[in-house]
């Protein structure tokens, strides 16, 4: 019986530790996509609707803020699309890019952690164009550090929650 009690306490401890593990999955807020044809910061994301969730991390001013030191897996998926019903592309040669950036407040600095993308030729003869970028990586992050997303050509972003999103989850503590 003692062993069973110990075991259940162990399960509870493990479960509460897992529940305390920080994670975030943020989806694009389609009503507030910025304009611009160059690199712009995406600051409007959902954290509590549809697929979007956050726990033991903070979303503020367009940035995902780390609350616990640790090693985190960061990921971002950005979809670009254009359909001729919305008009024509003013240029057919496009650079479609995403940048995942870490900003440190304590020592004011900014680093690009990941970038992805391609130059594309989207011919005006085609009715529909689509391009998807997925980046992911394992990073040591400290409490207070902020993660943000920048993209090129935001007017071409796919606004669906399954298309444009980013997130993070803690994998382990820093030894």
């Amino acid at each position: 019986e003692k062993a069973m009690v110990d075991g259940s306490w162990l399960d509870l401890a493990k479960r509460s530790k897992l529940e305390a593990q920080p994670f975030a999955h943020l989806t694009i807020n389609a009503t507030d996509i910025p304009s611009g044809s160059h690199k712009v910061s995406l600051s409007s994301w959902y954290h509590d609707r549809g697929w979007a969730k956050i726990s033991n991390m903070t979303f503020s001013n367009g940035k995902l803020i780390v609350n616990q030191d640790g090693f985190y897996y960061l990921y971002a998926n950005i979809c670009f699309r254009h359909h001729e019903t919305s008009g024509d592309l003013a240029t057919e040669y496009l650079q479609l890019m995403v940048y995942v950036t870490k900003t440190s407040i304590k020592i004011p600095s900014s680093h690009t952690l990941m970038k992805g993308g391609s130059t594309k030729y989207w011919s005006g003869n085609s009715e529909f164009h689509f391009y998807s970028i997925n980046v992911g990586g394992f990073f040591k992050l400290r409490s207070g550090e902020e993660i943000s997303i920048e993209v090129s050509n935001p007017s071409l972003l796919d606004p669906d929650q399954d298309a444009t999103y980013f997130g993070a989850f803690k994998v382990r503590d820093i030894d």
């Epitope: 304009s35 611009g36 044809s37 254009h82 001729e84 019903t85 919305s86 008009g87 024509d88 592309l89 003013a90 240029t91 057919e92 496009l94 050509n153 935001p154 007017s155 071409l156």
Partner: antibody
Framework: QVQLVQSGAEVRKPGASVKVSCKAS????????IHWVRQAPGQRLEWMGW????????KFSQKFQGRITVTRDTAASTAYMELRSLRSEDTAVYYC???????????????????WGQGTLVTVSS | EIVMTQSPSSLSASVGDRVTITCRAS??????LNWYQLKPGKAPRLLIY???SLQSGVPSRFSGSGSGAEFTLTISSLQPEDIATYYC?????FGQGTKVEIK
């Protein structure tokens, strides 16, 4: 205020060419596209083509491909539309119109024509 | 190629009447639909863009609605200065026009 002022009426013989100008003022000419639209007597409006005034890119209706040239002079904030090998069916009022989409804010030419020129009557008659 | 069809081709109404013009697209165009007013000898005027957004400076008696393939332009209270031909437009395609006259 935004204004598009077009050149005056023209009369041409069949087979000739005509060049219509459209002078823009009141906004940054390079940040917008200019479209050309015509209306023949008793007919609906007909889109002919556009020019991105910033980079000079153009797109034309299949109907006019090979007969139309659209250019721009950014220093003079003026767009030009030349139509060649004129026939009597080309008798129409030709309009220039500004696309509402600011190219600094995005790269989609939206086809919302927010300002128009007063029109230029081109008569093709032998 | 998308074809835009307007109805009626002409109408006659009294001052103060509510006037409705319909525009149909040959396939779904979401809300990418604009309305223009044309008066002889004058520059065309954008009234409504994006199916229902009123262009600045246009009187509030003009309104637009619809999405997909069916759209309407409504003049809630016809005024003498509204005598004109009205066109719907999606990108490169225009409707054939509706001529509005006063009874």
């Amino acid at each position: 205020q935004v204004q598009l002022v077009q050149s005056g009426a023209e009369v041409r013989k069949p087979g000739a060419s005509v060049k219509v100008s459209c002078k823009a003022s009141g906004y940054d000419f390079s940040n917008y596209a200019i479209h050309w639209v015509r209306q023949a007597p008793g007919q609906r409006l007909e889109w002919m083509g556009w020019i991105n005034a910033g980079n000079g890119n153009t797109k034309f209706s299949q109907k006019f491909q090979g007969r139309i040239t659209v250019t721009r002079d950014t220093a003079a904030s003026t767009a030009y539309m030349e139509l060649r090998s004129l026939r009597s069916e080309d008798t129409a009022v030709y309009y220039c119109a500004r696309d509402s989409a600011n190219m600094v804010r995005g790269i989609i030419i939206a086809y919302y024509f927010d300002y128009w020129g007063q029109g230029t009557l081109v008569t093709v008659s032998s | 190629e998308i074809v835009m069809t307007q109805s009626p081709s002409s109408l006659s109404a009294s001052v103060g009447d509510r006037v409705t013009i319909t525009c149909r697209a040959s396939q779904s165009i979401s809300r990418y639909l604009n309305w223009y007013q044309l008066k002889p000898g004058k520059a065309p005027r954008l009234l409504i863009y994006g199916a229902s957004s009123l262009q600045s400076g246009v009187p509030s008696r003009f309104s637009g609605s619809g999405s997909g393939a069916e759209f309407t332009l409504t003049i809630s209270s016809l005024q003498p200065e509204d005598i004109a031909t009205y066109y719907c437009q999606h990108t490169r395609a225009f409707g054939q026009g509706t001529k509005v006259e006063i009874k």
